[in-house]
């Protein structure tokens, strides 16, 4: 069964078959005997019963309103209502492009990665039985596909098959014909992937520093969406509160990954921060990658070759 | 912007009364249904009364009788006339607004206001 029309805002295009179905459709079939009324209002029109006899376009049944087809005067509030349910639509009929195929404000956007699975269907359950031919467009040029019921591609992606797709389906009612159409809008995107996440620079980096000043041990990595990036140093975490793990900055790159940094703040330098480890670690499902800093007097600076420093 | 603001709550004796009001954007006004809800201390929140489309209105059995439901289109505000207040009527007292209402539940895209405190003491 089609199921029932519960966003509050519907946006459609003029010209095309339309419908609205409340959402206590199962419990109107039980209560047959029930009344059932449906009301539009829109700006100094408050609230008219709609019926047969409104408009030779509105066809109501117990679930369903429908506009064969709907027009951009149809704009307005809609409302069902039976014993103690009620249910408001607001619908907004824009005009169609008359020099496309498709309204571009009616368009459903799509990415897919190539080389991966990418699929399009021409379906349209709730008018199914009186469907009498569809087809699909690509950039508005008829794709001529085997099946003219319900064409479908099927294939990996290639950056050639980016475009816009159309499906339209032209069917009959009380002897007019009519067409809906459904458009995507494809995006084919490099290969998203993930990485193995690298922490930039050496491994080890000897940080020259002054007693009583501070220092800001940057660390950089670039890793996937979901991969984390942390500070490890002493015995016990937080227990200097001289140190301080700053918010962690994130850019995404070109190719979809995400350059990450995160500094470690050491205040007021003392002794007991010189000559120990604090490591920098990038996690992943696949596994880690750790740097270490090490702070060293200015003073002892001679005793280690200068290409292992950082500034 | 959709937005419900009550006011009206505050501390009562009980069989006092008490007249909550709730304003809204023409948005939340316009919508399927408004009503009041309350919760009070450690419990879930409970339907107190709604006006549906075309004034129909539903109330919770504890405040039949003695609760009046009542709304004024030119000013967007919805109103709850409590009378005969009861001890178990304490709580916070929300406005709330719906596009799918079913009597007193709210099933579909729902706005809330912040609420309003009432205080009823024997």
């Known amino acids: 069964a089609e199921s029932c029309t519960s966003r509050p805002h519907i946006t459609v295009v003029e010209g095309e078959p339309f419908y609205l179905k409340h959402c206590s459709c199962s419990l109107a079939h039980e209560i047959e005997t029930t009344t059932k009324s449906w009301y539009k209002s829109s700006g100094s029109q408050e609230h008219v019963e709609l019926n047969p006899r409104s408009s030779s376009r509105i066809a109501l049944h117990d679930c369903v309103l429908e506009f064969w087809p709907v027009e951009l005067n149809d704009t307005g509030s809609y409302f069902f209502q039976m014993k103690n349910y009620t249910q408001k639509w607001k619908l907004n009929v824009i005009r169609r492009n008359k020099h496309s195929c498709f309204t571009e404000r009616q368009v459903t956007s799509k990415i897919v990665e190539v080389k991966k699975f990418f699929q399009i269907t021409c379906e349209n359950s709730y008018y199914q039985t009186l469907v009498n031919s569809t087809s699909l467009y690509k950039n508005c040029k008829k794709l001529l596909l085997e099946n003219n019921k319900n064409p479908t591609i099927k294939k990996n992606a290639e950056f050639e098959d980016q475009g816009y797709y159309s499906c339209v389906h032209f069917l009959h009612h009380n002897g007019k014909l009519f067409n809906i159409t459904k458009t995507f809008n494809i995006t084919i995107v490099e290969d998203r992937s993930n990485i193995v996440p690298v922490l930039l620079g050496p491994k080890l980096n000897h940080v020259a520093v002054e007693l009583g000043k501070n220092v800001r041990l940057n660390c950089s990595a670039l890793l996937n969406e979901e991969d984390v990036i942390y500070w490890m140093f002493g015995e016990e975490n937080g227990s200097d509160p001289n140190i301080h793990e700053e918010k962690e900055m994130r850019i995404m790159t070109p190719e979809g990954k995400w350059h990450a940094s995160k500094v470690l703040r050491i205040e007021n330098i003392g002794e007991s921060n010189l000559n120990v480890l604090y490591n920098c670690t990038v996690a992943s499902t696949g596994g880690t990658d750790t740097k270490s800093f090490i702070l060293v007097r200015k003073a002892d600076m001679a005793d280690i070759p200068g290409h292992v420093f950082t500034r | 912007q959709v937005q419900l603001q009550e006011s009206g709550g505050g501390p009562v004796q009980a069989g006092g009364s008490l007249r909550l009001s709730c304003s809204a954007s023409t948005t939340a006004y316009d919508n399927a249904c408004m009503g009041w809800f309350r919760q009070a201390p450690g419990k879930e929140r409970e339907g107190v009364a709604s006006?549906?489309?075309?004034?129909?209105?539903y109330y919770a059995d504890s405040v039949k009788g003695r609760f009046t439901l009542s709304r004024d289109g030119a000013s967007k505000t919805l109103y709850l006339q409590m009378n005969s207040l009861k001890p178990e009527d304490s709580g916070t007292y929300y406005c709330?607004?719906?596009?799918?209402?079913?009597?007193?539940?709210?099933?579909?895209?729902?706005?809330w206001g912040q609420g309003t405190q009432v205080t009823v003491s024997s």
């Open positions: 709330a607004s719906s596009n799918i209402c079913n009597g007193l539940n709210l099933q579909g895209n729902t706005y």
């Open positions: 006006i549906h489309l075309r004034d129909r209105t």
